[in-house]
């Protein structure tokens, strides 16, 4: 018997996403299947469906297909996640360009070459034709869509609407014209899903016919999505292992671009004098490694023969013999010129962020015992003596008195961030000093923090508001505002304070702001029962390089069944890898036509490792910073969003885990997102609403 | 090479359209707010708008309405839309790197674009 | 909305002598004043910020001082390459503002 082709191989697949329709007049057919390949033969061959089958829902869990005559493009029709649910669409439904003569187009394109409109194939004016729908079943001659039912020679074509010219070809670019890769295609995230030959590339998540290492789920940030061409391995161009049981791999035809620039996520600083992260940007003349022997040249293959040469690493600067980093290693190298040594290090290359302060501080500068006096505002230090009431109040030790001389900085508290000082300023009562920890001191503030030691949940149950639990309440949601108009989000943690990023207070006029609460539409329409409008006070910025700011409310928030607040985690804890978490935000989405109101995208905790590697290695998290990932792709925080929460539950309490800061990209698919911490930072936040003045209700 | 260099200046027509750009290397520009400035033959400077680094953008009242401000991050470019010039509009615009993410002094310059509106 | 008024508009002073500039904010500025230097057919340079703190790289005879609404820009002795126009520009706010630059002053030789 003949073995039926596997089908899933023409279907895109969006992990963990379902399709919902809006009109009830669309159909769907649903069955019990085991596999999503089941579901893809059926919706290929369209076998006993009442429709065209244009992508089907596998339901993991129910081990159902849901078939469906219309895709995510179609009007009627949303998306929705969830984590039972794999949707796959017909790739040639979705494509805009064709794969040889285009025979298998069924996109939407419908002028001609010339700019005339195509004539619905279902009528005969003003051109009659054998071209009917009926006759040509599969063909998918819907609409006045350019079409290729007979796969001729010029392309998709159709009947125009200008009785004078009877029908003509349509514009519609190859595939291998409209997709194009930077330099060797390792950030190739197009659409190519066939070989330079023409064999259908074998789907990533597939181990036949042929078995292979590269699963997406083991390279989540090598975007091996369906069965596209990927260079995940530095070869030439990208590549694919073929459908074709008797040819392992193949390249793709992809061309470079014109304008062969890479992605900005993608572009390493470029340095000469001195190495930024891992130095891949480092385009500078040092030519030996670290011990001063000389390097060999890139393009020679001896003493050494290798493959590094610049014809396959087309935008890594592999000139002459200088020191590079091309393929992602810890610093740059180069083959030497000594037959024994065949690779070398060039660490004798300065790191660029060598501060050279006068004054500094180790660990958390509990032991500084420096002359400074002036906090980083610039204000001068008020004697400790005089403040030492105020001291007591907020820690529960005695501080070392002998320490504590004239007004120098110092940090009797402990506090996670250097060493501080009080002002005589009642509005700013103590600020951290400009004094930066010494060059290299690595000693970590909080140890063990991807081993949950602390919990971050403070052993208490979910408030309840009568009677009802809040868990679908986001009445801590705060939309800050600028000029009458949303700019970014924020966390009401307490009656008078809303925790959100630094760089959303463009204006230092505090006229210039205002704070809503209670709302769900970013216009407030609808909302004005439970709105409230408040005006900022105060702005205190976090520690330096923390992007938090805490931001005083003029008037103190009313607690109702519409505004709460959320509670902070505690100081130091860590919480599980894979914890579900949200993010909320009235920011951009990618729609045009947004409804403004207030959209949460989930997320999973990621370890701050794993999370580096997802970045390519080019991101180093450190212990102020927290990472999750989106369980849907390219679902997460973007412009707008900014300030608001990452908010995670643990023991039944929902707590503000992250801070939404600008500088990771806009909810980049297979890239997780990178927020602050706060519970690095939760001590700075207590002792903040502990020593500021806030207004009394 | 930290810098800035503008281009798409040149000779357009009163109640035109004009779209100037602004390269940035050695920084991105989405880490810092940026800034339009210009400045007119033999006058002084005057601020035509900014974008910040959250994306929010505020313009002069002479430039409201008409002058959009956007940035291409994959591109690391700046770019200044100029509809329904006026006469009035003829000045040397510059493209300025504001410091840090907010409102705030300029701490590097581009070499300058001159628009000239002229029927 | 904030406006700024630079004087004078222009100023005649020979070489070594000492130079001062004024700029008023309409309303309170804080210290977030900066002043830049230009000359004919070229960018502004940055000279000071935060009213009084020097930009890298600039001569130790600029200073700044003030705060609030009114502020001073001072060339102790004045030096040939400093023959320019200087211009104040508030770093406060822009909402509402027509422009966050000063009228401008030009230095020249007497």
């Known amino acids: 018997q003949r073995k039926r082709r596997n089908t899933i191989h023409e279907f895109k697949k969006s992990a963990k996403t379902t399709l919902i329709k809006i009109d009830p007049a669309l159909k769907i057919k649903t069955k019990k299947v085991n596999t999503a390949d089941q579901c893809a033969n059926r919706c290929t061959r369209n076998k006993g469906l009442p429709f065209t089958c244009k992508a089907f829902v596998f339901d993991k869990a129910r081990k159902q297909c849901l078939w469906f005559p219309f895709n995510s493009m179609s009007s009627g029709v949303k998306k929705e996640f969830g984590h039972e649910f794999d949707l796959y669409e017909n790739k040639d439904y979705i494509r805009n360009c064709i794969i040889g003569k285009g025979r298998s187009y069924k996109g939407t394109v419908s002028i001609t070459k010339s700019g005339i409109k195509c004539q619905p194939w279902s009528s005969m004016i003003p051109h009659e034709h054998s071209f009917l729908p009926s006759s040509y079943r599969g063909k998918d001659l819907q609409e006045n869509y350019c079409r290729n039912p007979r796969g001729e020679e010029g392309g998709p074509w159709c009947f125009t609407s200008n009785p004078e010219v009877r029908y003509e070809v349509c514009d519609i670019p190859q595939c291998s014209e409209v997709e194009c890769m930077t330099c060797n295609g390792e950030s190739y995230r197009g659409l190519m899903d066939h070989t330079e030959s023409g064999k259908i590339c074998q789907r990533w998540d597939h181990q036949t016919p042929h078995r292979h290492k590269f699963l997406p789920e083991r390279y989540p940030d090598k975007g091996f999505d369906d069965n596209y061409c990927r260079n995940p391995d530095g070869q030439p161009r990208p590549w694919c292992y073929t459908l074709d049981p008797h040819t392992r791999w193949e390249y793709c035809a992809i061309k470079t671009c014109a304008d062969n620039t890479m992605n900005d996520t993608d572009v390493p600083l470029e340095t000469t004098e001195c190495i930024q992260g891992q130095g891949e940007g480092y385009r500078g003349t040092v030519n030996t490694i670290w011990n001063g022997i000389p390097c060999q040249r890139w393009d020679s293959q001896y003493p050494h023969e290798h493959d590094m040469t610049p014809e396959n690493f087309k935008c890594k600067d592999l000139r002459e013999n200088y020191c590079r980093n091309p393929d992602g290693s810890e610093s740059p190298w180069c083959f030497t010129t000594d037959p024994n040594i065949r690779v070398g290090y060039c660490s004798q290359i300065p790191n660029c962020d060598m501060s050279h302060g006068q004054d500094c501080y180790r660990g958390n500068g509990k032991n500084y015992m420096g002359n400074l006096s002036q906090t980083r505002s610039g204000l001068t230090c008020s004697m400790w003596d005089k403040n030492m009431e105020d001291l007591h109040r907020h820690i529960f030790w005695e501080p070392d008195a002998s320490k504590l001389n004239e007004n120098y900085c110092r940090n009797p508290d402990d506090d996670a961030h250097g060493p501080w000082c009080y002002t005589g300023n009642p509005l700013i009562p103590w600020d951290y000093c400009p004094i930066s920890r010494c060059e290299g001191d690595t000693t970590p503030t909080i140890v063990n923090l991807d081993h949950p030691v602390i919990s971050c949940a403070k052993t208490k149950q979910l408030r309840v508001v009568n009677g009802i639990p809040t868990r679908t309440n986001i009445g801590w949601m705060v939309s800050l505002r600028y000029r009458n108009k949303h700019i970014c989000g924020g966390s009401l943690i307490k009656e008078s304070w809303v925790l959100t990023a630094r760089q959303c207070f463009p204006s230092r006029d505090l006229k210039d702001y205002e704070a809503w609460l209670g709302i769900h539409d970013v216009h407030g329409r609808g909302d004005e029962k439970c709105k409230q409008v408040l005006n900022v006070s105060q702005l205190v910025y976090g520690p330096e390089g923390s992007d938090l700011v805490l931001m005083k409310l003029a008037r103190p928030a009313v607690l109702d069944d519409f505004v709460s607040t959320i509670d902070l985690p505690n100081y130091g804890c860590t919480i599980p890898e894979k914890t579900s978490c949200s993010v909320y935000g009235w920011g951009y989405t990618g729609l045009i036509n947004y409804d403004g109101l207030l959209r949460v995208a989930h997320l999973y905790i990621m370890g701050n490792e794993k999370c580096s590697q997802h970045h390519r290695g080019k991101v180093t998290l450190n212990e102020s910073e927290i990472c999750a990932g989106a369980e849907k792709i390219g679902s997460g925080p973007c412009e707008g969003d900014y300030g608001g929460p990452l908010v995670c539950e643990q023991h039944k309490m929902r707590m503000v885990l992250g801070v939404i800061v600008p500088g990771r990209g806009c909810a980049i698919p297979n890239r997780p997102g990178i927020f602050v911490r706060v519970a690095y930072y939760a001590k700075w936040i207590h002792k903040i609403i502990l020593t500021y003045k806030v207004p009394q209700s | 090479e930290v810098q800035l260099v503008e281009s798409g200046g040149g000779l357009v027509q009163p109640g035109g359209s004009l779209r100037l750009s602004c390269a940035a290397s050695g920084f991105t520009v989405s880490s810092n707010a940026i800034s339009w400035v210009r400045q007119a033959p033999g006058k002084g400077l005057e601020w035509v708008g900014v974008i910040y680094v959250i994306g929010v953008t505020d313009y002069a009242s002479s430039a409201q309405g008409r002058f959009t401000i956007s940035r291409d991050n994959s591109k690391n470019t700046l770019y200044l839309q100029m509809n329904s010039l006026r006469a009035e509009d003829t000045a040397v615009y510059y493209c300025?790197?504001?410091?840090?993410?907010?409102?705030?002094?300029?701490?590097?310059w581009g070499q300058g674009t001159l628009v000239t509106v002229s029927s | 909305d904030i406006q700024m008024t630079q004087s004078p508009s222009t100023l005649s002073a020979s070489v070594g002598d000492r130079v001062t500039i004024t700029c008023q904010a309409s309303q309170s500025i804080s210290s977030w004043l900066a002043w830049y230097q230009q000359k004919p057919g070229k960018a502004p340079k940055l000279l000071i910020y935060e009213a009084s703190k020097l930009a890298s790289g600039v001569p130790s005879r600029f200073s700044g001082s003030g705060s609030g609404t009114e502020f001073t820009l001072t060339i102790s002795s004045l030096q040939p390459d400093d023959f320019a126009t200087y211009y104040c520009q508030q770093a406060y706010s822009v909402a509402n503002v027509d422009n966050a630059f000063g009228g401008g002053t030009k230095v020249e030789i007497k």
């Open positions: 300025a790197r504001v410091y840090d993410s907010g409102w705030n002094h300029f701490n590097l």
